[in-house]
């Protein structure tokens, strides 16, 4: 079944990324995204989610890990890790299906 967007009240989340307008944001849920681009160190971004909650269910890969939570500042102290290198047959990126 499709994952429905959250209809609940907004939560306040820690915001730490190049695009944050301040130290916190308000959204339907809080997020932490750990991303490693080719040849670069992993970067961890914290913020708010409002769309596509299905990404929260994606399995961690060697390139990305998504974490979501639903309470006040719940993303503040979360640290994520990436999976070990995958077999060559698997593709990078998490497809939420």
């Amino acid at each position: 079944d499709p994952v429905k967007p959250s209809r609940g009240p907004l939560v306040t989340c820690t915001c730490e990324s190049p695009h944050c307008k301040g130290p916190t944001c308000r959204g339907a849920w809080c997020t932490v995204v750990l991303v490693r681009e080719e040849g670069r160190h992993p970067q961890e971004h914290r913020g708010c989610g409002n769309l596509h909650r299905e990404l929260c269910r994606g399995r961690p890969t060697e390139f990305v890990n998504h974490y979501c939570c639903d309470s006040h500042l719940c993303n503040h102290n979360v640290s994520l890790v990436l999976e070990a290198t995958q077999p060559p047959s698997e593709q990078p990126g998490t497809d939420g299906q």
């Epitope: 994952v3 967007p5 990078p92």
Partner: antibody, heavy 118, light 108 residues
Framework: QVQLQESGPGLVKPSQTLSLTCTVS??????????WNWIRQHPGKGLEWIGY???????YYNPSLKSRVTISVDTSKNQFSLKLSSVTAADTAVYYC??????????WGQGTLVTVSS | EIVLTQSPGTLSLSPGERATLSCRAS???????LAWYQQKPGQAPRLLIY???SRATGIPDRFSGSGSGTDSTLTISRLEPEDFAVYYC?????????FGQGTRLEIK
């Protein structure tokens, strides 16, 4: 303001792979507020969503196309790309890219017609 | 997936009249993530309404959206010649994203 522009071959042979790129200007593809989508429209028909990619590289595809679709992102070039494998005449369509946020799909690229023919 | 069914398929009206376009979903859609688009021949779709009832930037106030649950409506209060086009509803924000089949608004 943000603009999107599709590019790629207008003619693809059956059984080959269709490859298109969407270049984003006037804004960053790396913003966590946006999802980057591909949509297509067969001649004289309605709109069909193909899939999206997030700046993190995470994707979600239309189940009807999932086995043939790959969407990727290059944040350094501010581009995202579509690959559709094993194409047939039924994949002839205008292909659009579009930015999605909580206020829907806006803006859209102008669209590019891809014809599948030998 | 959520199937969106638009009605009527074609609507024939004259400039100055009121147009009412319907979009029915196969299951409940969050009104926060229901949009309407206008498309003219040879052009990309243009966002009109998002969140079921909020007008996009630059959209005239003769366009309005309403509804919740499974039923949404786009109303054009007084048709202008440039309003004759195809209109699509869409549910977004959760996947798979789907569009209605479209309503063609033509000059009577």
């Amino acid at each position: 303001q943000v603009q999107l522009q599709e590019s790629g071959p207008g003619l693809v042979k059956p059984s080959q792979t269709l490859s298109l790129t969407c270049t984003v200007s006037g804004g960053s593809i790396s913003s966590g507020d946006y999802y980057w989508n591909w949509i297509r429209q067969h001649p004289g028909k309605g709109l069909e969503w193909i899939g999206y990619i997030y700046y993190s590289g995470s994707t979600y595809y239309n189940p009807s196309l999932k086995s043939r679709v790959t969407i990727s992102v290059d944040t350094s070039k501010n581009q995202f790309s579509l690959k559709l494998s094993s194409v047939t005449a039924a994949d002839t369509a205008v292909y659009y890219c579009a930015r999605e946020d909580i206020a829907g799909f806006d803006p859209w690229g102008q669209g590019t017609l891809v014809t599948v023919s030998s | 997936e959520i199937v969106l069914t638009q009605s009527p398929g074609t609507l024939s009206l004259s400039p100055g009249e009121r147009a009412t376009l319907s979009c029915r979903a196969s299951q409940s859609v969050s009104s926060s993530y229901l949009a309407w688009y206008q498309q003219k021949p040879g052009q990309a779709p243009r966002l009109l309404i998002y969140g079921a009832s909020s007008r996009a930037t630059g959209i005239p106030d003769r366009f309005s959206g309403s509804g919740s649950g499974t039923d949404s409506t786009l109303t054009i209060s007084r048709l202008e010649p440039e309003d004759f086009a195809v209109y699509y509803c869409q549910q977004y924000g959760s996947s798979p994203i789907t569009f209605g089949q479209g309503t063609r608004l033509e000059i009577k």
